[in-house]
Interface confidence: low
Amino acid sequence: QPSVSPGEPSPPSIHPGKSDLIVRVGDEIRLLCTDPGFVKWTFEILDETNENKQNEWITEKAEATNTGKYTCTNKHGLSNSIYVFVRDPAKLFLVDRSLYGKEDNDTLVRCPLTDPEVTNYSLKGCQGKPLPKDLRFIPDPKAGIMIKSVKRAYHRLCLHCSVDQEGKSVLSEKFILKVRPAFKAVPVVSVSKASYLLREGEEFTVTCTIKDVSSSVYSTWKRENSQTKLQEKYNSWHHGDFNYERQATLTISSARVNDSGVFMCYANNTFGSANVTTTLEVVDKGFINIFPMINTTVFVNDGENVDLIVEYEAFPKPEHQQWIYMNRTFTDKWEDYPKSENESNIRYVSELHLTRLKGTEGGTYTFLVSNSDVNAAIAFNVYVNTKPEILTYDRLVNGMLQCVAAGFPEPTIDWYFCPGTEQRCSASVLPVDVQTLNSSGPPFGKLVVQSSIDSSAFKHNGTVECKAYNDVGKTSAYFNFAFKGNNKEQIHPHTLFTP
């Protein structure tokens, strides 16, 4: 028994005065606790605890289950213990089969012995299988067998406690080790969408997915720069033993403009933390913004192609799109598509493909788009560049030569006189009158120019050339003159195209 200094309270004394006592099954256990301030006896084995307020603990017929630690406590809280083994050849182990181990920690296989004198107290795999090579253990007859540094790979390991009794191996009931994983990385978090655009009154719902090795991962939705607790709902799944998934769904049933902001899904475990954010923008009503991808004034050569392209932002989604020319709607020749396949996309592209444009097809081409909230439109002014065409070339009764040409841009008319039979008309003649006439065609059509010269100035046989030209090309008409006596005779005019 421990020695104490005089005057200090001393622990109780127990008879028999030894730390361990071995009795046979069926024998009597008689333990006496001597102390003037005796309070109680306590018996402990595995999860079981019994108390006795008598100072003498008597068990008339000992059973294996009476094996355990008997502790006598006095009123000073001081105690003394004796460990009793009740040897029962038919029950060598006391067993608590629940066996949980935290990864990288030690765990106790609770199979204390009822006979400390058996040998080779150890662990064995079930059905004769070997234990994992790296599994280390320390046996303790009073407590069980401590597995050192549990590995994740031991999960569901089936094992027995084992002893040798009279040269034979005796196994306990089987234990199944359940390993609780340690956190060795931060949680993996992801969000259903990185940004949300809503109208006032619409429901905002966003889901954060948290993945980790076990369900003890912590997660929450937070609003940046706010301490307000957000309402969230959870769903969770175990995809196998060390693969846990939680979905945390945040909902605002009727979003307001002032709900706009950044929301963070935060998760942490004992290793560290991770977060992901989503942005909410709430607008009071929908919108459409159109951005032309080319200049809205377009010049194109006759017979060439042009693509009228717009990008536009539309929220909510666009419902009607159309291209219009001269109050007519195009049914083909155009396509409309989202700028990206992203679920959050609000940007779209519309293209009108105009092919082999004629001079008569200039004008205003309008793109119209609408959604449930607003309409929007943009106009393109298309000018078709055409080489001049000489509409009329006549000798008027007043002796004037007149040439009328049409084209775009506005043609210039020059006059030349070729004396005799010369093919090249180089001497230029100044016109008497030049007028730009109003075209009867649609706006953006060809421009008509009329130019006149006085034929009385020509005194010799020859040819007069009316040449109309612009940036696209040129066209000429010719007047042939021959003098008979004093009379001037106009031979039929003709045109030649000079590229």
Partner: antibody, heavy 119, light 107 residues
Framework: EVQLLESGGGLVQPGGSLRLSCAAS????????MSWVRQAPGKGLEWVST????????YYADSVKGRFTISRDNSKNTLYLQMNSLRAEDTAVYYC????????????WGQGTLVTVSS | DIQMTQSPSSLSASVGDRVTITCRAS??????LNWYQQKPGKAPKLLIY???TLQSGVPSRFSGSGSGTDFTLTISSLQPEDFATYYC?????????FGGGTKVEIK
């Protein structure tokens, strides 16, 4: 989508052998313990065998121990049950099932394959 | 092996009734107790795991309780699609065992 599809059942004479297969899709077999459960005509469910996710640990009902062998081919994502020395009392629909983890029950089951042992 | 005993083995009930099925284990299985529903010609379906946790997608009229050796499955208001056989199963031991089943029939 998780799916389990058993095959290999049929009529066999007492003492004969059969190998049942369970093709898994929609998940990785190595992450889950897998079990075979059988149901004799008009009777209840009887557990037959379990194999751990790693394939390192196998467990059998006393009634089939020594005769049946559970295995898995992770490259084919397939579970097997080799049944030898078959008896009339082994006649049943055999289901393969996935353990949802940490013994939280068998969360996905195949449609079953019928094994009839009769002379 | 751990024996699982279900009672009653069959019962007749009407739509809207509250139905209770009990399952008793021959030794403590803590909360390692699962419930399944099986309809004729079909594979069993997991309803409840860990004695009281509803499997995803299972209606909330199903509930489970208990720990140790005594467990209960309750259907708060029986629906036409609930007529089936129900099994309990312990997964505490590596040797899984099922109860004998309870057949719920239309009265």
């Amino acid at each position: 989508e998780v799916q389990l599809l058993e095959s290999g059942g049929g009529l066999v004479q007492p003492g004969g052998s059969l190998r049942l297969s369970c093709a898994a899709s929609g998940f990785t077999l190595t992450s889950y313990a897998m079990s075979w459960v059988r149901q004799a005509p008009g009777k209840g469910l009887e557990w037959v065998s379990t194999i751990s996710g790693s394939g390192g640990y196998t467990y059998y009902a006393d009634s089939v121990k020594g005769r049946f062998t559970i295995s898995r081919d992770n490259s084919k994502n397939t579970l097997y049950l080799q049944m030898n020395s078959l008896r009339a009392e082994d006649t049943a629909v055999y289901y393969c099932a996935r353990d949802s983890g940490y013994d939280r029950g068998l969360d996905y089951w195949g449609q079953g394959t019928l094994v009839t042992v009769s002379s | 092996d751990i024996q699982m005993t279900q009672s009653p083995s069959s019962l007749s009930a009407s739509v809207g009734d509250r139905v209770t099925i009990t399952c008793r284990a021959s030794q403590s299985v803590r909360t390692y107790l699962n419930w399944y529903q099986q309809k004729p010609g079909k594979a069993p379906k997991l309803l409840i795991y860990d004695a009281s946790t509803l499997q995803s997608g299972v209606p909330s009229r199903f509930s489970g309780s208990g720990s140790g050796t005594d467990f209960t499955l309750t259907i708060s208001s029986l629906q036409p699609e609930d007529f089936a056989t129900y099994y309990c199963q312990q997964s505490y031991s590596s040797s899984i065992t099922f109860g004998g089943g309870t057949k719920v029939e239309i009265k």
